[in-house]
Interface confidence: low
């Protein structure tokens, strides 16, 4: 029988900067019942606080509700594991809520084949930001990524949409049934899960010649190719 092994706080996430949750991995239990407690203080404060809610986030978690969450305040936290033989502490983790946001997936994904008589056909994709994210005040800039593939294909085709909530795609296989999904991330946070897939049947007459394809990419601003330097800076996967 031994003191508990060292726990590790391995993840903290916030859906919207208003609340957040952290999770830890227990170390070895030393063969004895072990109690875990998370304590924290905020940068610039000396007063230590205990986790306000061990329930909401599930096992080995601490949830910080609205009244415990401050934007741009760094939280310094650690987990204490205790059994009859002694205690061990995790390393301190520094958490700034601004940088741990993982939003819910975008909503209301709609996909439509557009075939204007006088122009090139294209796939039109539209969606809405997740409801928990308050975009109006500008604290969030959400970036979006779309993926699509023919139903039976193995590989996804990925398009970065920047801050747009709609997107046009030109090059598709006629007659195929496509799966389309979208996800989002704040500029300093993590990608959401992919939205539920939407299916779209591409008509058999969805065709264009090479000349049309080149023209249409110009017409549409080259969305599939031209990513700004700022977008490239933010276009990383966590």
């Amino acid at each position: 029988q031994l003191p508990p092994g060292k726990p590790e706080i391995f993840k903290c996430r916030s859906p919207n900067k208003e609340t957040f949750t952290c999770w830890w991995r227990p170390g070895t239990d030393g063969g004895l019942p072990t109690n875990y407690s998370l304590t924290y203080h905020r940068e610039g404060e000396t007063l230590m606080h205990e986790c306000p809610d061990y329930i909401t986030g599930g096992p080995n978690s601490c949830h910080f509700g609205k009244q415990y969450t401050s934007m741009w305040r760094t939280y310094i936290m650690m987990v204490n594991a205790t059994n009859q033989m002694g205690s061990s502490f995790s390393d301190e983790l520094y958490v700034d809520v601004t940088y741990i946001v993982q939003p819910d997936p975008p909503l209301e994904l709609a996909v439509e084949v557009k075939q204007p008589e006088d122009r090139k056909p294209y796939l039109w994709i539209k969606w809405s930001p997740p409801t928990l994210i308050d975009l109006k005040t500008g604290w969030f800039t959400l970036l979006y990524e779309i993926r699509l593939k023919p139903e039976k294909a193995a590989e996804w085709e990925i398009h970065f949409a920047g801050q747009q909530t709609e997107f046009k795609i030109l090059s598709l296989h006629p007659g195929q049934k496509y799966l389309v999904q979208v996800r989002c991330k704040p500029d300093h946070g993590y990608w959401s899960a992919w939205s539920p897939a939407t299916f779209i049947q591409i008509p058999s007459d969805f065709t264009m010649n090479d000349e049309q394809k080149l023209i249409s990419e110009e017409d549409l601003g080259g969305e599939q190719k031209l990513i700004s330097e700022e977008d490239l800076h933010h276009h990383h996967h966590h």
Partner: antibody, heavy 116, light 107 residues
């Protein structure tokens, strides 16, 4: 160092127009919302409106909506306030401000006087 | 619109005094609140953001607290350069709104 420099203020007739400019330096202008705030002589601060990073969205206080237009030119690090149908109550110092991650930065202001 | 009220509207104090200014929002604004200091003829200066976080370079005698609808700005030991007008502002919803200001002058 963050700097915001407003210009374009002056005397205008009621019903007239003015265009204010604000040139920014010391931060990546194109990645932040920008705001205009005004202050009538001897009075408090009033938020006028703001504009999204790419210029695609503007928000205004009701008293100026339909008369004032906020725009920006990210290539020139510039913010603009086009003021039409000016009224006496629009008189005051107009500040441009940026809501950076950690607080606001403000210009020195430019005075707008609406009088006949 | 969210209405912001401040009290007192003015106060007289001496150097070394502790001063507290209160700001109240007409509805819950979480911690989406700033405090500004403005001296005559100058632009406002950001002191505190997110209700309680001191802006870089602002002396530690300034502190902010509150959450929801009630907020306070405290100056623990008033210095000559602190005589000014102080404004709170909410940025929870549009339009952003300022309090009417509290003027702190020399007794």
């Amino acid at each position: 160092e963050v700097q915001l420099v407003e210009s374009g203020g002056g005397l205008a007739q009621p019903g007239g127009s003015l265009r204010l400019s604000c040139v920014a330096s010391g931060f990546t202008f194109s990645t932040y919302w920008m705001s205009w705030v005004r202050q009538a002589p001897g009075k408090g601060l009033d938020w006028v409106g703001n504009i999204k990073q790419d210029g695609s969205e503007q928000n205004y206080v009701d008293s100026v909506r339909g008369r004032f237009t906020i725009s920006r030119d990210n290539a020139k690090n510039s913010l603009f306030l086009q003021m039409n149908s000016l009224r006496a109550e629009d008189t005051g110092v107009y500040y441009c401000a940026t809501l950076l991650t950690k607080g606001d930065y403000w210009g020195q202001g430019t005075l707008v006087t609406v009088s006949s | 619109d969210i209405q912001m009220t401040q009290s007192p509207s003015s106060l007289s104090a001496s150097v070394g005094d502790s001063v507290t200014i209160t700001c109240r929002a007409s509805q819950d604004i979480s911690n989406y609140l700033d405090w500004f200091q403005q001296k005559p003829g100058k632009a406002p200066k950001s002191l505190i953001y997110a209700a309680s976080i001191l802006q870089g370079g602002v002396p530690s005698r300034f502190s902010g607290s509150g959450y929801g609808t009630d907020f306070t700005l405290t100056i623990s030991s008033l210095q000559p350069e602190d005589f000014a007008t102080y404004y709170c502002r909410q940025y929870k919803t549009y339009p952003f709104t300022f309090g009417p200001g509290t003027k702190v002058d020399i007794k």
